[in-house]
């Protein structure tokens, strides 16, 4: 499916706890509101114009796997995040990894397997 402007749909789903997008082409992920109540977001086998700069205050689990496009990681603001799976995206990540990349100090699980070049230049400060 190709979803060009689906913010109206997202706004209707602001209070669901889990949300999954599979095999979707989507350009406007940064239109997600910080206030959305999602606790678990799954983006699998989707196509993005750029890495989605997610900003979601309630999100605890993010599964972002096997996606195409947006090959450079850019920071997200997910203050409640505990679980992050970024595997199999062909991502390059210059300067992994610090609290400031994810906007959280709560991270317990991080999977960066099967990606591109991951350059480690921080010692997981704030993610201990």
């Amino acid at each position: 499916y190709y979803l060009d402007d689906i913010i109206d749909l997202f706004n209707c789903l602001t209070n669901v706890s889990s949300f999954s997008l599979v095999s979707v082409t989507i350009e406007r992920v940064k239109d997600f509101s910080y206030n959305f109540g999602w606790q678990h977001l799954e983006l699998v086998n989707c196509k993005f114009g750029q890495f989605p700069t997610l900003k979601l205050k309630s999100l605890k689990r993010l599964t972002f796997t096997s996606n195409k496009g947006g090959n450079a990681f850019s920071e997200v603001d997910l203050p409640s995040l505990e679980f992050l799976d970024l595997s199999r995206n062909g991502l390059s990540f210059k300067g992994c990894c610090s609290q400031s990349d994810f906007g959280t100090t709560s991270l317990k699980y991080l999977d960066l397997s099967f990606n591109g070049v991951i350059t480690m230049s921080s010692n997981f400060l704030g993610l201990e």
Partner: antibody, heavy 118, light 107 residues
């Protein structure tokens, strides 16, 4: 507590290069966040100039891209601004700031006034 | 670039009055809008993030609302110490941009 402190000459001649340094205490700049320069001409609003990410990546306001350089010295925990070919319109209070993940600025230096005049 | 237009430019208000400052974006920015207070000869201070989320330590009389293109900063029951210039800033896209500012004066 993170603190930022700008320093540099308060007077620069037209066509010269403006050079400022921001000393950071309370957080190692090589371990996280991005570190920004923002300026404010006297009596006017704020203009974002550019930043250096903790990885060393830099990005700038397109309006300044041909004249601006931002670098860092992690051993001194400081980052620097250079702005070339300055004119009177570059007269401003220059602030350094730390941006959080959500593209906002919780931490600012106190600012330093730079006047461009012969 | 995203242009932020603030209104009014200037407001003269008596203590305990309610102040409303608006910020309009040239395109939709979801809720990626932040507010700052700047007192004379001081650096800006973050008041509100993401349109409506108060920063720790900021008095509860400051509140924000809005989404998309239209945003509001409200100061309920203005106090003398609130005399300052207030700026909005969008974090939706680079280059990051600020509104032109609203100066609030105490009558």
């Amino acid at each position: 507590q993170v603190q930022l402190q700008e320093s540099g000459p308060g007077l620069v001649k037209p066509s010269d290069t403006l050079s400022l340094t921001c000393a950071v205490s309370g957080y190692p700049i090589r371990f996280g966040y991005s570190w920004h320069w923002i300026r404010q001409p006297p009596g006017k609003g704020l203009e974002w100039m550019g930043y250096i990410h903790y990885s060393g990546y830099t990005d700038f306001n397109p309006s300044l891209k041909t004249r601006i350089t931002i670098s860092r010295d992690t051993s001194k925990n400081q980052f620097s601004l250079k702005l070339s070919s300055v004119t009177a319109v570059d007269t401003a209070v220059y602030y350094c700031a730390r941006k959080d993940s959500g593209n906002y600025f919780p931490y600012w230096g106190q600012g330093t006034l730079v006047t461009v005049s012969s | 670039e995203i242009v932020l237009t603030q209104s009014p430019d200037f407001q003269s208000v008596t203590p305990k009055e309610k102040v409303t400052i608006t910020c309009r974006a040239s395109q939709s920015i979801s809720d990626h809008l932040h507010w700052y207070q700047q007192k004379p000869d001081q650096s800006p201070k973050l008041l509100i993030k993401y349109a409506s989320h108060a920063i720790s330590g900021v008095p509860s009389r400051f509140s924000g609302s809005g989404s998309g293109t239209d945003f509001t900063l409200t100061i309920n029951s203005l106090e003398a110490e609130d005399a300052a210039t207030y700026y909005c800033q969008q974090g939706y896209d680079f280059p990051l941009t600020f509104g032109g500012g609203t100066k609030v004066e105490i009558k």
